[in-house]
């Protein structure tokens, strides 16, 4: 029961996780499907159960080892297959010669915190999570600040073209509530994409001192 278009997309978090999404117009909702991973130069293989995320797409995470273990390198190729049960047999529905370091999507930055806040500026720091030591300093960040009365989509993007895990936000309004998010991307990889946005960090600027111009 397959017709129309299809897609199979996977990303490596640079350490021990490959996340996959498979979409298939006209596929049966109650079909049991899995992603199988066979690296070309490793002794292990791995399987995950595809679970529905929408009407015609399924997702799963291949957990390759402990979160911070370096399970794959730039020379690895992992054969990924989508297998769906059809009666008593498994059918191959998709296949990919997956080059992990060409298809990177890191975990969202974590541990956001306000280092210092004033009336018009705020210094914020964060950490990257489960990022390979292979990148050294070859990472970039995007940040955005949610101002009162605006949406995240309207927030201008601030680009940090180097591995800088802090930012000083300026020209803020005194005594105002803001939210801040950041995301990260390695410079390496033809199909590499941005990490998800971090959890928002809420902060409030200090009120202006009474009797002073602001």
């Amino acid at each position: 029961a397959v017709n129309g278009t299809s897609q199979f997309t996977c990303f490596y978090n640079s350490r021990a996780n490959i996340s996959c999404v498979w979409s298939q117009d006209g596929a049966l909702q109650d079909t049991s499907c899995q992603v199988h991973a066979w690296p070309d130069r490793r002794r292990w293989n791995q399987t995950c159960e595809l679970l529905p995320v929408s009407q015609a797409s399924w997702a799963c995470n291949l957990i390759l080892g402990a979160p911070d273990s370096q399970k794959l390198t730039t020379v690895d190729i992992v054969t990924l297959r989508v297998l769906c049960r059809e009666g008593v047999r498994w059918r191959v529905m998709a296949i990919q010669d997956f080059k992990p370091f060409e298809n990177l999507r890191l975990m969202a930055p974590i541990s956001l915190q306000v280092v210092h806040v004033e009336t018009h500026r705020c210094n914020i720091s964060w950490e990257i999570s489960q990022a390979s030591h292979y990148f050294e300093r070859h990472l970039e960040f995007e940040a955005r600040t949610l101002s009162p009365g605006h949406t995240w989509e309207e927030a201008p993007l601030l680009t940090l073209k180097q591995k800088q895990e802090w930012i000083c936000l300026e020209t803020l309004t005194p005594d105002t509530q803001y939210e801040f998010q950041v995301r990260v991307k390695p410079l390496q990889g033809e199909f590499t994409t941005w990490s998800p946005w971090s959890q928002p960090l809420a902060f409030r600027t200090k009120p202006a001192a009474l009797g002073k111009d602001t």
Epitope: V2, T5, V82, M93, A94, Q96, D97, F98, K99
Partner: nanobody, 122 residues
Framework: QVQLQESGGGLVQPGGSLKLSCAAS????????MSWVRQAPGEGLEWVSY????????HYADSVKGRFTISRDNAKNTLYLQLNSLKTEDTAMYYC???????????????RGQGTQVTVSS
Amino acid sequence: QVQLQESGGGLVQPGGSLKLSCAASGFRFSNYGMSWVRQAPGEGLEWVSYINGDGSRTHYADSVKGRFTISRDNAKNTLYLQLNSLKTEDTAMYYCEKGLSRDGWSLSAASRGQGTQVTVSS
């Protein structure tokens, strides 16, 4: 638009051989992995073999491994499947399919040819 035209099918005795071709047009052939799939009478579609964009990596279903060989000629925009040691259970309509990228393919009627019939019978 994408066009795929299979040819080379026919009637052959068990143990015999055939070579299927798939002429591709409407897209940059070398930028896409390609697969052969087949459908036996009254059965669902079965993936047979896959080759990546530059022809350096191939994969086969267990049922055809060691008997079938997939190849491609990017200069001619043509995909091939050499079928050897044919069995009656290889009887099916054979289709070529355009992949998603240089390195991937997913079963999709939207990028499939009209097929060529292979019949293995004594």
